[in-house]
């Protein structure tokens, strides 16, 4: 059987507002006083098994003791009333759980949304944490009828149990209640149709147009409560590889529609589209985005001709020369489609023009030593580009006019070239470059620049610490001008090895040192200067600096009959590298000298 407690704590279910004071009393039963030979002065209060200081306790009379707590902050405290029976044995009389928290704030920012095909969901901001069990109830009514209450599970939202009725205003509010108080939000009044979030448009399809390479036609299916709502659309698109979306102006898609033509697109480009919808009045919520759909604009004729150049191979006989016509494949943005082939036309004055159809990017022809005009056009399935025209002069004609002040310099991991144009109008410029090496031939790459350009960077994949020979040729209507060349590095490094020094001539007090230039493959940069370090086995080291144009140097004021150790280093802008050490001995006597 349950034992009757010896007394009680009041209140039995204490809930306190945080930061306030709270007093509890423990009342002992008369039978208890007699049985244990105690009174209220024997009561010991404990919170979470720790004794409460005496100064917080007041003995009201022989049966009753009170305890007062100021500025309560702990969320939950076990408060027990205990007696010292027979003056020493502590016995529990009663215990309660004291909770602390706050009354509910007035809920704010109450909003409702009708997700198409679902019941209405309302959300609100409950305000500060109450730390207490708090019930939030969503209330709703028409002017004449109340709807079932919606008990919130999470305290911030609730989905009503009834289907919304459209085109009739509804009043909605939230009531919040806990042990410390009850409060209602402001009510909101609206027609549920103005809170609809439609399901995303679906079956989005994209088709191109053979007539216009700059458009794509979109079509889709909208729901809009099964046609009950008129929806306007929001269309966004991007190229397949882009990460940012381009917005179709919303004013273009304001009227209800299920198709749209997007304009001003690039030819033969894959675009990705997405679409969302909202009630045409703009009230309610945008749907989620549709599934993405992609389409490719139709091809258009290439927008410009390829870069076009030629190289003449040394002729075997006197009558003919082998000419290699070369061109660059157009980038996709200019090809506007799949390039099927290139058309090269060779013409001469009062002669039958000759047309070659080539699938690659070069054509070698045997030409006479007369002047030719070559034209080049790229072709896709829509048509041909404009023609690039090159005059190939007779090899007996000396090229006049070159660029001046040709410079090259690295910047931002690119190798830049700049020049001053020649004094005659230029059609274009050709830049050629290759890696200078003693171990491999100079395999040229090239690029074309417009006549207006006089500063550009090399567009190939360049390597660091390699010496590039760069040539710039202006091209005129009458043919190429003179070529100007220079050497440059994308990035210099210290040489891979230093010079190997030797003696050319050794005298009693001087020695002529000689060395070979470091091979270009090992230079790793422009050799700016050399240092020569020399010493005897006991003397201190001497250093002389020599200009990079020299390949020999005379050491003077040497001691006779002495062993010298010599080492040479070569320096680029990025550092130096020592060559191997070399020793020589000066003779005891000069030539013809006797002891």
């Amino acid at each position: 059987q349950l034992l009757e407690p010896c007394g009680y704590i009041y209140p039995e279910f204490p809930v306190v507002q945080r930061g306030s004071n709270f007093t509890a009393i423990c009342v002992l039963k008369e039978a208890c006083l007699q049985h244990y030979y105690v009174n209220a002065s024997y009561i010991v209060w404990k919170t979470n098994h720790a004794a409460v200081p005496r100064e917080q306790v007041t003995v009201i009379n022989r049966t009753t003791s009170s305890v007062t707590f100021t500025d309560v902050v702990l969320p939950s405290v076990q408060l027990t009333c205990n007696i010292l029976s027979f003056g020493q044995i502590e016995q529990n009389v009663y215990g309660v759980t004291m909770l602390s928290g706050f009354p509910p704030d007035k809920p704010t920012n109450l909003t409702c949304i009708v997700n198409e095909g679902k019941n209405m969901l309302c959300q609100w901001d409950p305000g500060r944490e109450t730390y207490l069990e708090t019930n939030y109830t969503l209330k709703s009514e028409w002017a004449t009828e109340k709807f079932p209450d919606c008990q919130s599970k999470h305290g911030t939202s609730c989905m009503v149990s009834y289907m919304p009725t459209y085109y009739v205003n509804i009043e909605v509010w939230v009531e919040a209640e806990n042990a410390l108080g009850k409060v209602s939000s402001e009510s909101i009044n609206f027609d549920p149709v103005d809170k609809v979030k439609p399901t995303p448009p679906y079956n989005l399809s994209v088709t191109n147009s053979e007539e216009l390479s700059s458009i794509l036609k979109l079509s889709w299916v909208s729901s809009g409560l099964g046609g009950l709502l008129d929806l306007k659309s929001d269309i966004q698109y991007r190229t397949k590889d882009a990460s940012t979306w381009i917005q179709v102006p919303l004013e273009d898609t304001m009227s209800p529609r299920t198709s749209f033509t997007v304009q001003d697109l690039k030819p033969f480009t894959e675009y990705v589209f997405r679409i969302r919808s909202i009630k045409d009045s703009g009230k309610g919520y945008w749907s989620d985005w549709s599934e993405e759909a992609s389409g490719t604009t139709y091809e258009d004729r290439p927008s410009r001709p390829p870069s076009f150049w030629y190289k003449t191979n040394p002729s075997h006989g006197q009558e003919y020369r082998s000419v290699r016509l070369i061109w660059k494949a157009l980038p996709l943005s200019e090809a506007n489609g799949k390039i099927l082939d290139y058309e090269v036309i060779l013409t001469q004055s009062k002669s039958v023009s000759q047309t070659y159809t080539v699938t690659g990017t070069e054509l070698t022809v045997n030409l006479t030593n007369d002047r030719y005009v070559a034209s080049l056009a790229a072709r896709n399935k829509v048509g041909k580009s404009a023609a690039a025209v090159l005059t190939i002069p007779s090899p007996h004609v000396t090229a006049a006019y070159s660029v001046v002040n040709l410079k090259a310099f690295p910047k931002d991991n690119l190798l830049w070239v700049e020049w001053t144009p020649p004094p005659k109008p230029v059609s274009k410029y050709i830049l050629e470059w290759c890696v200078l090496s003693e171990n491999a031939p100079c395999v040229e790459d090239w690029q074309q620049e417009d006549a207006t350009v006089n500063r550009t960077h090399l567009r190939g994949r360049l390597l660091e610490s390699k010496c590039y020979q760069i040539t710039v040729t202006p091209v005129f209507a009458t043919g190429p001008g003179g070529s100007e060349s220079l050497k440059a590095y994308l990035k210099q490094a210290a040489p891979a090895r230093g010079p190997t020094v030797r003696t050319k001539k050794v005298g009693k007090n001087e020695a002529v040192l000689a060395w070979d230039q470091i091979p270009v493959d090992d230079q790793n940069g422009f050799i700016r200067n050399y240092s020569i370090s020399y010493r005897t086995s006991v003397g201190k080291e001497m250093v002389v600096h020599v200009d990079s144009s020299h390949t020999e140097y005379t050491l003077s004021s040497l001691s006779s009959d002495t062993l010298y150790m010599v080492r040479m280093a070569a320096y680029t802008d990025e550092g130096g590298k020592d060559g191997p050490e070399f020793t020589f001995t000066t003779p005891k006597f000069a030539q013809g000298e006797i002891e």
Epitope: E319, Y320, I345, L346, T347, Q348, K350, S351, V352, S353, Q354, T355, Y356, T357, V365, N366, L367, T368, D370, Y372
Partner: nanobody, 125 residues
Framework: QVQLQESGGGLVQPGGSLRLSCAAS????????MSWVRQAPGKGLEWVSA????????YYADSVKGRFTISRDNAKNTLYLQLNSLKTEDTAMYCC??????????????????WGPGTQVTVSS
């Protein structure tokens, strides 16, 4: 300055023969392939025959194959076309034309023109 002067045309009966000549100047004749073309009244230009710079390779349109013969004399800077077994459909203005390279390649496309005065061949009974 390229100059071409055709001669040797005339009026001939069906089955008859003619020899056309083309005197060239203003360029290195021996370095270039040459062609004969013709234009019948109210028709477009039609290629007839071609010969490479050295004279070793010759080419003919199907309509004249076996009847016409092209030749050249590089020493005299002259191109020839021997017309045999002439038919009424061979009636046309005949012109010679200079190519831009030493070889004629049937796989290439050519844009022909009459730069010289041409010589008229009329086949009629």
């Amino acid at each position: 300055q390229v100059q071409l002067q055709e001669s040797g045309g005339g009026l001939v009966q069906p089955g008859g023969s003619l020899r056309l000549s083309c005197a060239a100047s203003g360029f290195t004749f021996s370095s270039y392939a040459m062609s004969w073309v013709r234009q019948a009244p109210g028709k477009g230009l039609e290629w007839v025959s071609a010969i490479n710079s050295g004279g070793a390779s010759t080419y003919y349109a199907d309509s004249v194959k076996g009847r016409f013969t092209i030749s050249r004399d590089n020493a005299k800077n002259t191109l020839y076309l021997q017309l045999n077994s002439l038919k009424t459909e061979d009636t046309a203005m005949y012109c010679c034309a200079k190519h831009v390279t030493g070889d004629y390649d049937p796989s290439l496309r050519y844009e022909y023109n009459c730069w010289g005065p041409g010589t008229q061949v009329t086949v009629s009974s």
